[in-house]
């Protein structure tokens, strides 16, 4: 059965996944997809890297995290009802029929309706994903999310109250991890 | 067009080997994980192997992982498929065919070879 | 292993006739079910994939249904050239599994 993960809509959403690549910089395949785990690959495709980098991501999807260390974890930006569904997170370990696969179940709940708007507070928004594509991604650079009117000492805040809540351990505790070698 | 055609087949006495090739035309082969599928005479289809577009990763019904190893040349646009200590229960029609491509999406054999009859008998 | 199972194993019918064959999947595969025809002497050819989406020019009297265990195959309205064995294909889980097959025979 699926692990159940939740977002609101509006919020971007966070789908833990990691690996432990052999030794540094030794990158595993991975791709993430929309549908459950097939035999092979992801469904749908939303987003792959290779054994250097990102190599193909639609829009609304990136890896927020240091990929380079393992951190496959997906974030989905400004998420709608139609998000909702099963996720694939695949690690394409070679060899024979070594493939690490794991299903993680979206819940996207409706906005609270809220008298003024509050701040957002998801770290993962503070800041643009600019990735050069390789291989079969689209051939300019793109910058995945938009950066809002933010200062250093808000990023600097922001960070802080991220360390503080722990939330990155919390989240890494409760995602699949792999070691590999 | 998309074509692939096999080759390699013919007849091979119990313990011998073959090796069956497919070459492939008509589209990115590197795109495709690309597979062989079976049909004894007068029986249904059965998958023998799998592998993803570079060659890195292979998969095999369990049965015939010891016996049986896929490959493929993406320079020559060519898969293949080596199979030692055959056995008379090995004797069928091979398939190749195209499997899922680099986007996911299509799961499903969506362009299949003629096919190559094995026989192995003494 | 996951099994595929189809019924009927065999079938006669009529040109014209609406035909239904269906196959159960011994887990639940989603949506990651093809349906093939093969006729004597020759390669299958995909009909369906992704349990309902009708491959490429394949005629609309094919249709596909169903996800988790139970899926449909349906010929709307048969064609002579659609008498044939028709297999079904999970994409789930390994080993890739068929269905027995269904043949399909003049009435």
């Known amino acids: 059965s699926e692990v159940e993960y939740r977002a609101e809509v509006g919020q971007n959403a966070y789908l833990p996944c990691f690996y432990t690549p052999a030794a540094p910089g030794n990158l595993v395949p991975v791709c993430w997809g929309k549908g459950a785990c097939p035999v092979f690959e992801c469904g749908n495709v939303v987003l792959r890297t290779d054994e250097r980098d990102v190599n193909y991501w639609t829009s609304r999807y990136w890896l927020n995290g240091d990929f380079r260390k393992g951190d496959v974890s997906l974030t989905i930006e400004n998420v709608t009802l139609a998000d909702s569904g099963i996720y694939c997170c695949r690690i394409q370990i070679p060899g024979i029929m070594n493939d690490e696969k794991f299903n993680l179940k979206l819940v996207i709940k409706p906005a609270k309706v809220t008298p003024a708007p509050t701040r957002q507070r998801d770290f993962t928004a503070a800041f643009p994903r600019m990735l050069t594509t390789r291989g079969h991604g689209p051939a300019e650079t793109q910058t995945l999310g938009s950066l809002p009117d933010i200062n250093l000492t808000q990023i600097s805040t922001l960070a802080n109250e991220l360390r503080d809540s722990r939330l990155a351990n919390d989240l890494r505790d409760s995602g699949a991890t792999i070691r590999i070698g | 067009e998309v074509k692939l055609v096999e080759s390699g087949g013919g007849l091979v006495q119990p313990g011998g080997s073959l090796r069956l090739s497919c070459a492939a035309s008509?589209?990115?082969?590197?795109?495709?994980?690309m597979a062989w599928v079976r049909q004894a005479p007068g029986k249904g289809l059965e998958w023998v192997a799998n592998i993803n577009y570079d060659g890195s990763s292979t998969y095999y019904l369990d049965s015939l992982k010891s016996r049986f190893t896929i490959s493929r040349d993406n320079a020559k646009n060519s898969l293949y498929l080596q199979m030692n200590s055959l056995k008379a229960e090995d004797t069928a029609v091979y398939y190749c065919?195209?499997?899922?491509?680099?986007?996911?999406?299509?799961?499903?054999?969506?362009?299949w070879g003629q096919g190559t009859l094995v026989t192995v008998s003494s | 292993d996951i099994q595929m199972t189809q019924s009927p194993s065999s079938l006669s019918a009529s040109v014209g006739d609406r035909v239904t064959i269906t196959c159960r999947a011994s887990d639940n595969i989603y949506s990651y079910l093809a349906w093939y025809q093969q006729k004597p002497g020759k390669a299958p050819k995909l009909l369906i994939y992704?349990?309902?989406t009708l491959a490429e020019g394949v005629p609309s009297r094919f249709s596909g249904s169903g996800s988790g265990t139970d899926f449909t195959l349906t010929i709307s309205s048969l064609q002579p050239e659609d008498f044939a064995t028709y297999y079904c294909q999970q994409h789930y889980g390994s080993p890739l599994t068929f269905g027995q097959g269904t043949k399909l025979e003049i009435k």
């Open positions: 065919a195209r499997d899922v491509g680099y986007y996911g999406g299509n799961y499903g054999f969506a362009y």
């Open positions: 008509g589209f990115t082969f590197s795109d495709y994980y």
């Open positions: 992704n349990a309902k």
